[in-house]
């Protein structure tokens, strides 16, 4: 039994890191393998992660971690019984994939303005709380070409757009994702989408 693709890990910079790797053949990850991990820290203890299958030869492990700080470094040991298959380390702050924003809501009761709001996925004491920027994706269910991205580079988790920038009388969907420039993170997954019917009063044409 050998490791074909070494474990690669990403952290949500809060409490979970996800590690994925591939074996050289079909493997029952949960019965045959164990991933041991430990924070390099005077007050830490070793933890064991039981991996799940991720395709025939692929394995994935969700590591429960202490709240992350930038200096954290974890040792990783992949075992098959008594055999050490791979040994490595992982700095969560260098491989961050933020959590997806939640509670996306479209407020249509403001006169001719759409207000989209969502929740920051981090608590206020987390470093990323004040460092997230967002991308909002809005698209028409009727017209695949009607697809747009709004970059929200300020900290407030909201976006205001004129209803008239979208077509009236049809349904739209929106979703939002986050990233943090400070740690050069990847984008988060998209939030669940939310749907609304866009309608607004056309301005009277003057001749």
């Amino acid at each position: 039994m050998k490791v074909l693709q070494e474990p690669t890990c990403v952290s949500d910079y809060m409490s979970i890191s996800t590690c994925e790797w591939k074996m050289n053949g079909p493997t029952n990850c949960s019965t045959e393998l164990r991933l041991l991990y430990q924070l390099v820290f005077l007050l830490s203890e070793a933890h064991t992660c039981i991996p799940e299958n991720n395709g025939g030869a692929g394995c994935v492990c969700h590591l429960l971690m202490d709240d992350v700080v930038s200096a954290d470094n974890y040792t990783l040991d992949l075992w098959a019984g008594q055999q050490l298959l791979w040994k490595g380390s992982f700095k969560p702050s260098e491989h961050v994939k933020p959590r997806a924003p939640g509670n996306l809501t479209v407020h249509t009761n403001v006169s001719d303005t759409l207000l989209l709001t969502w929740s920051n996925p981090y608590p206020p004491d987390n470093y990323l709380y004040n460092h997230l920027t967002y991308a909002v994706n809005i698209w028409s269910e009727n017209d695949p070409a009607d697809f747009r991205i709004y970059n929200v580079t300020y900290l407030e988790p909201s976006l205001r757009i004129a209803a008239s920038t979208l077509k009236s009388g049809i349904s739209y969907r929106a979703r939002v994702r986050a990233w943090a420039q400070c740690y050069n993170t990847t984008w988060s997954e998209w939030s669940p989408s939310t749907k609304w019917h866009n309608s607004y009063r056309e301005p009277f044409e003057q001749h």
Partner: antibody
Framework: EVQLVESGGGLVQPGGSLRLSCAAS????????MFWVRQAPGKGLEWVSG???????SYADSVKGRFTISRDNAKNSLYLQMNSLRAEDTAVYYC?????????WGQGTLVTVSS | EIVLTQSPGTLSLSPGERATLSCRAS???????LAWYQQKPGQAPRLLIF???SRAPGIPDRFSGSGSGTDFTLTISRLEPEDFAVYYC??????????FGQGTKVEIK
């Protein structure tokens, strides 16, 4: 908002015991290492003890064998059991959250060891 | 055990002046594990700098940290009235734990 509130300080005779408590709120207590740091009157800061999320502990040489740190994650509380107290243990005792450094501190509780 | 020595013991300056505080370690300290704190009379310490040079949330940019190995510096570019306080450096070591310097008092001249 992160808050740490110490209690349990007071006047105790040399050789006596005292138990300090720290009530934590505003963060996930169970995922953070916690510490006691003290400051004798007019003096500098001294790390006393720390406890990891899994219960691993460490102590300064000056208190080893006399003080015991513990935590109750269900109650979001940190404790310091202080036995065989000496005059030189007189200090303000601060509860702190952290790891390699201490990012949040309580306001402290004064322990006076005197006959 | 790593010993941290801060200098000077007291720094007498006027508001608007630049303050330079030194922290010297008896052995090399990882930049990741060096922090600075501010403490005012009757108050708890407040984290200013971690990782030798990263400002803690809410700390004004007039505070900056630098250095590596055994020599570290906290600089306050222009002293404000609220900056007069005692400043401590602190290090963490995987075997010995946490130690503080003895402090530098920044007082009004």
């Amino acid at each position: 908002e992160v808050q740490l509130v110490e209690s349990g300080g007071g006047l105790v005779q040399p050789g006596g015991s005292l138990r300090l408590s720290c009530a934590a709120s505003g963060f996930t207590f169970s995922r953070n290492a916690m510490f006691w740091v003290r400051q004798a009157p007019g003096k500098g800061l001294e790390w006393v003890s720390g406890i990891g999320t899994g219960g691993a502990t460490s102590y300064a040489d000056s208190v080893k064998g006399r003080f015991t740190i513990s935590r109750d994650n269900a109650k979001n509380s940190l404790y310091l059991q202080m036995n065989s107290l000496r005059a030189e243990d007189t200090a303000v005792y601060y509860c702190a959250r952290g790891r390699y450094y201490f990012d949040y501190w309580g306001q402290g509780t004064l322990v006076t060891v005197s006959s | 055990e790593i010993v941290l020595t801060q200098s000077p013991g007291t720094l007498s300056l006027s508001p608007g002046e630049r303050a330079t505080l030194s922290c010297r370690a008896s052995q090399s300290v990882s930049n990741s594990y060096l922090a600075w704190y501010q403490q005012k009379p009757g108050q708890a310490p407040r984290l200013l700098i971690f990782g030798a040079s990263s400002r803690a949330p809410g700390i004004p940019d007039r505070f900056s940290g630098s250095g590596s190995g055994t020599d570290f510096t906290l600089t306050i570019s222009r002293l404000e009235p609220e900056d007069f306080a005692v400043y401590y450096c602190q290090q963490y070591d995987h075997s010995a734990g946490w130690t503080f310097g003895q402090g530098t008092k920044v007082e009004i001249k």
